[in-house]
């Protein structure tokens, strides 16, 4: 019996507007009705929590109002979008999935998505 598998893409390039989207998919060992998804950022062996949301299966993912993340869920798949990214935010973004209810609790961690963010070049001053 294998541990809960969490899959996510290896690499994602953020858009010029600093938006990156990726899918986090998990193979559930149980029939979870409440799931918690956390995005962690690992850079220079420092780990920080980017955002987290708990959702009921079949319902929308709700992040805090001031969160830089938004997302939707479909079955055992979560579509995550991170906004407001800048070049300094380049790093490994790890999807952590916790099956909260009903018991038992299960924990799964993805291998991480390397998000590359390139700051857009400033527009040159116009002579006209």
């Amino acid at each position: 019996c294998k541990a809960m598998h969490v899959a996510q893409p290896a690499v994602v390039l953020a858009s010029s507007r600093g938006i990156a989207s990726f899918v986090c998919e998990y193979a559930s060992p149980g029939k979870a009705t409440e799931v918690r998804v956390t995005v962690l950022r690992q850079a220079d062996s420092q780990v920080t929590e980017v955002c987290a949301a708990t959702y009921m299966m079949g319902n929308e993912l709700t992040f805090l109002d001031d969160s830089i993340c938004t997302g939707t869920s479909s079955g055992n798949q979560v579509n995550l979008t991170i906004q407001g990214l800048r070049a300094m935010d380049t790093g490994l973004y790890i999807c952590k999935v916790e099956l909260m209810y009903p018991p038992p609790y299960y924990l799964g961690i993805g291998n991480g998505t390397q998000i590359y963010v390139i700051d857009p070049e400033p527009c040159p001053d116009s002579d006209f």
């Epitope: 019996c1 541990a3 790890i94 209810y101 018991p103 038992p104 609790y105 924990l107 961690i109």
Partner: antibody, heavy 120, light 107 residues
């Protein structure tokens, strides 16, 4: 510094109740999951229960399910274990422990324990 | 429930000796495994978390390895203060079970 201090242990008769407390200090209590772990005389460590940081999610060992209730008061920085219908096999030193970790959870701080003896 | 087994259940070793304790889970727990040291009458102490990460303040003679179902705790050079009982614990799924323990005493 982080401190966890258990209290409420003592001698109790089978079938009776007892409430353990764990007073926490030195950290933001409301940000951490908290656990109870016990050790019966001459035996190993046994995980008893966990309560998530916000108190919404609780899980129990099969041996205490339906008899023990874990709770917390974040305004008082205190963790509780309500133990009902106590049995002789519940005799143990009870520890509270803080759960930390980004990827997974581990118990980085423990109290010194409080002894519960169930005997007639 | 996930069962955790440890071997040996006890061992005698000399100061300066190398000690290896193994822990096996009844099913895969990825790397969600911790090691604790427990001396009688004291609070248990976290040594290793996430199978191989050394807890802050723990001497580097302690190391952990493994993933899936098989894990190892190694003490490279046993010191007098290391004589205690060692427990592995999984935090992949509730109940967060401990192994039965390995008692390390002086040869």
């Amino acid at each position: 510094q982080v401190q966890l201090v258990e209290s409420g242990g003592g001698v109790v008769q089978p079938g009776r109740s007892l409430r353990l407390s764990c007073a926490a200090s030195g950290f933001t209590f409301s940000s951490y999951g908290m656990h109870w772990v016990r050790q019966a005389p001459g035996k190993g460590l046994e995980w008893v229960a966990v309560i998530w940081y916000d108190g919404r999610n609780k899980y129990y060992a099969d041996s205490v399910k339906g008899r023990f209730t874990i709770s917390r008061d974040n305004s008082k920085n205190t963790l509780y274990l309500q133990m009902n219908s106590l049995r002789a096999e519940d005799t143990a030193v009870y520890y509270c422990a803080r759960a930390s970790g980004s990827y997974s959870y581990y118990f980085d701080y423990w109290g010194q324990g409080t002894l519960v003896t169930v005997s007639s | 429930d996930i069962q955790m087994t440890q071997s040996p259940s006890s061992l005698s070793a000399s100061v300066g000796g190398r000690v290896t304790i193994t822990c096996r889970a009844s099913q895969s727990i990825s790397s969600f495994l911790n090691w604790y040291q427990h001396e009688l009458g004291k609070a248990p102490k976290l040594l290793i978390y996430g199978a191989s990460s050394l807890q802050s303040g723990v001497p580097s003679r302690f190391s952990g390895s493994g993933s899936g179902t098989d894990f190892t705790l190694t003490i490279s050079s046993l010191q007098p203060e290391d004589f205690a009982t060692y427990y592995c614990q999984q935090t992949y799924s509730t109940p967060f079970t401990f192994g039965p323990g390995t008692k390390v005493d002086i040869k």
